[in-house]
């Protein structure tokens, strides 16, 4: 831990000769900055410099080449690289007076004579004198006002509101302060503050826009903070709104933005009290150009059962806004001829949905469909390929001679999507074929019997069984199945002999 | 030496208010921005709210931002958190913190359990 | 806000190991960090400040580095009583967000 700095003269105060020089030397285990009280404005004649010494300790030298009644005040040496803005500032002090017998009280800023009390609290009129030893008295509209006083900070007590002037007599001459106007303020736990971007995502060359608005509230410093401040990129307006109520509209604009302005875009309100803080923030993304992304939450091949109502949604990110539109096989998708609708809608400031719909999926609704979003900036599309899955169903079972052999083929065409699986089955004692148990599916490897399976089309499959020889009556069962159903049909198959008995007959 | 000693833990309903103090001595408290840290059962520490030396600001984090107010008074050394609208989540021990170092918290007190619960 | 992630989530050790904690902010916090120590019921203690600074009455065995995003705490020799669980915590501006914390378990 860095022990405290020390200060020379080593002294708790001092008083300094009007017009005279002073100078203030801080020594230091680390590099040590002064705080004093003219602002960087007045302080012209204050000059602070490093020193070099054989000690190994950092000196900071406070220099005043001519001294004034505004030179009064306290001066703090202090490690500038260990302060937190939490605490006070710590370091070493010495507070510095500079009598002048013309000016009796050191002169303030206009904001300093209001002074603010909250909630019956204790305040401090900040009337200080140049000298220590100056008598002072705090007056009001009633007379003299019974209050501690302190040379170095002023009158602290409990006052109503109202004007108070402090005098002072030096050398046989009065002196008065203008009037500190005392001002109470209802201590509210929150202020009312609202952050609104009508945009969080530019490109380059856009102009940013952010406001702040503070409600029922005019005491308020309000202080943005965002990634060109260090620039001084932004401008900054205020507008104050009387009717109905009040209301103060901070504007932050930052012209002609570039990739660099991106980050948190801050407004901190602060009561003139400093007591209620209230922040916003709001994130910025500032893009080289524009630019598009398509997130589909379906696969590049999708089915749809026939007669489904099927949605296909489609996220985009984009900026600036695009124009989307569907294809389909590459044309234009009119909706008005298909019971297909798509529509786009906004979820977020960049963000987009595209539904693409199906009322009643038929089979011509397959094919590719493709998603395609434009701007000024960039182009992307998404094509998948959908299929309409329809039940399987046979659409012929026949049978074919081959003469004298007696060898048959039995020909069963279905048709589906996906393209059906054809099973066979027979039934050898034609008298029992209505109980199922009497039906065995004709496996492949069986002798004299051959079966084979051709596809026709994408959706029509056509399956062949052959006997080679046929000797009695048998039922033939051609059983089509998909995914989305199974149909079957029967064919009786007569042996040649007994079909030539029957044709005599 | 320095003490933070926590106190007004206990067990409280959702939507109950409780308020926490912190006495401190052996330092010069007036100077210190002051913190409340908590700690849920079982989880990790989580900072809460800071309050300046001089009261002029404070922050709070998000997740008790408008339920919690952190308040202080320098004459009595004593920091406070008063606690309304509390719900499950809220449920840990309660620390206050400071310190110089950096902004570091060089001293803690012992903690307080606050246990909201139906 | 600034994330500050902790790996790893545990660690188990022997006594005269050397073990390395790592943490990393979301955003650049420059020196800005410490590292706290806590024990089961107790409340954490301050071991190293402003990423590298030795807090006093602090064992040497500990140490820390690290600047911008990336840090570490290191344990040269680990002693019995060092069994716990440590948080880094960013300590500029606030929220003063901590680590989800690294348990350093007995082997």
């Known amino acids: 831990q860095l022990s405290l700095p020390s200060i020379l003269p080593n002294e708790n105060e001092k008083v300094v000769q009007l017009n005279s020089s002073f100078s203030l030397r801080c020594f230091g285990e680390s590099e040590v900055s002064w705080q004093y009280p003219m602002s960087e404005e007045e302080s012209s004649d204050v000059e602070i410099r490093n020193e070099e010494n054989n000690s190994g300790l950092f000196v900071t030298v406070l220099e005043v080449s001519s001294a004034s009644a505004a030179h009064t005040g306290l001066y703090t040496c202090y490690y500038n690289h260990t302060q937190t803005e939490e605490n006070e500032l710590e370091g070493r002090h010495i507070y510095i007076y500079v009598p002048d017998p013309d000016v009796a009280f050191v002169p303030l800023g206009m904001t300093d004579y209001l002074v603010i009390v909250e909630d019956d609290d204790s305040a401090i009129i900040p009337c200080r004198t140049t000298d220590p030893e100056t008598p002072v008295t705090l007056h009001n509209s009633e007379g003299v006002v019974p209050a501690s006083y302190d040379s170095r900070q002023g009158f602290n007590g409990t006052f109503t509101v109202g004007p108070y002037i402090c005098e002072a007599t030096v050398k046989g001459k009065k002196f008065q302060t203008i009037p500190f106007n005392v001002y109470a303020l209802k201590a509210t736990s929150e202020l009312d503050l609202e952050m609104e971007a009508l945009k969080t995502v530019y490109k380059s060359g856009e102009t940013i826009v952010v406001t702040c608005a503070v409600f029922n509230n005019e005491v308020v410093d309000l202080q943005w903070t965002y990634p060109g401040e260090v620039k001084g990129k932004g401008i900054t307006m205020l507008e104050e709104i009387k009717v109905p109520s009040i209301k103060l509209v901070y504007t932050l604009t930052v012209p002609e933005a570039t990739v660099k302005d991106s980050g948190d875009y801050e407004c901190a309100a602060r009561q003139a009290t400093r007591e209620v803080k209230e922040m916003k923030k709001v994130t910025i993304s500032v893009h080289e150009k524009g630019f598009i992304e398509i997130k589909p939450t379906f696969s590049q091949l999708e089915a749809v059962n026939l007669h489904e109502v099927k949605h296909f949604v489609v996220e985009v990110r984009a900026y600036p806004p695009p124009r989307i539109s569907w294809l389909k096989n590459n044309l234009t998708l009119i909706e008005n001829l298909t019971e297909i609708t798509t529509d786009v809608e906004k979820i977020q400031e960049i963000r987009y949905r595209s539904k693409l719909k199906l009322i009643r999926a038929k089979e011509e609704d397959s094919g590719h469909y493709t998603i395609v979003a434009q701007n000024e900036d960039a182009v992307k599309s998404y094509t998948f390929e959908l299929l309409t899955q329809v039940p399987s169903s046979i659409l012929d079972l026949v049978d074919d001679h081959h003469g004298s052999t007696g060898g048959q083929t039995v020909r069963c065409t279905a048709e589906g999507t996906p393209l059906p699986d054809i099973e066979w089955m027979i039934c050898k004692d034609i008298k029992k074929c209505n109980n199922e148990t009497s039906w065995t599916i004709l496996a492949n490897n069986v002798s004299n019997i051959i079966t084979e399976i051709h596809s026709r089309d994408r959706s029509t499959v056509e399956g062949r069984v052959t006997f080679a020889k046929v000797e009695e009556t048998i039922a033939v069962r051609c059983l089509a199945k998909n995914l989305l159903g199974a149909e079957n049909r029967e064919l009786k198959l007569v042996a040649p002999t007994l079909r030539s008995e029957l044709t005599v007959a | 030496q320095v003490q933070l000693v926590e106190s007004g833990g206990g067990v409280v309903q959702p939507g109950r208010s409780l308020r926490l103090s912190c006495a401190a001595s052996?330092?010069?408290?007036?100077?210190?921005?002051m913190h409340w840290v908590r700690q849920a059962p079982g989880k990790g520490l989580e900072w809460v709210a800071v309050?300046?030396?001089?009261?002029?600001?404070?922050y709070y984090a998000d997740s008790v931002k408008g339920r919690f107010t952190i308040s202080r008074d320098n004459s009595k050394n004593t920091l406070y958190l008063q606690m309304n609208s509390l719900r499950a989540e809220d449920t840990a021990v309660y620390y206050c913190?400071?310190?110089?170092?950096?902004?570091?918290?060089?001293?803690w007190g012992q903690g307080t359990l606050v246990t909201v619960s139906s | 806000d600034i994330q500050m992630t902790q790996s790893p989530s545990s660690v188990s050790a022997s006594v005269g190991d050397r073990v390395t904690i790592t943490c990393r902010a979301s955003?650049?916090?420059?020196?800005?960090l410490a590292w706290y120590q806590q024990k089961a019921g107790k409340a954490p203690k301050l071991l190293i400040y402003?990423?590298?600074s030795l807090q006093s009455g602090v064992p040497s065995r500990f140490s820390g580095s690290g600047s911008g995003t990336d840090f570490t705490l290191t344990i040269s020799s680990l002693q019995p009583e060092d069994f716990a669980t440590y948080y880094c915590?960013?300590?500029?501006?606030?929220?003063?967000?901590f680590g989800q914390g690294t348990k350093v378990e007995i082997k």
């Open positions: 402003a990423a590298s």
């Open positions: 913190a400071g310190g110089r170092s950096r902004g570091a918290f060089d001293f």
């Open positions: 052996g330092f010069t408290f007036s100077s210190y921005g």
């Open positions: 955003q650049d916090i420059s020196s800005w």
């Open positions: 915590q960013r300590t500029n501006s606030f929220p003063r967000t």
């Open positions: 309050i300046w030396y001089d009261r002029s600001n404070k």
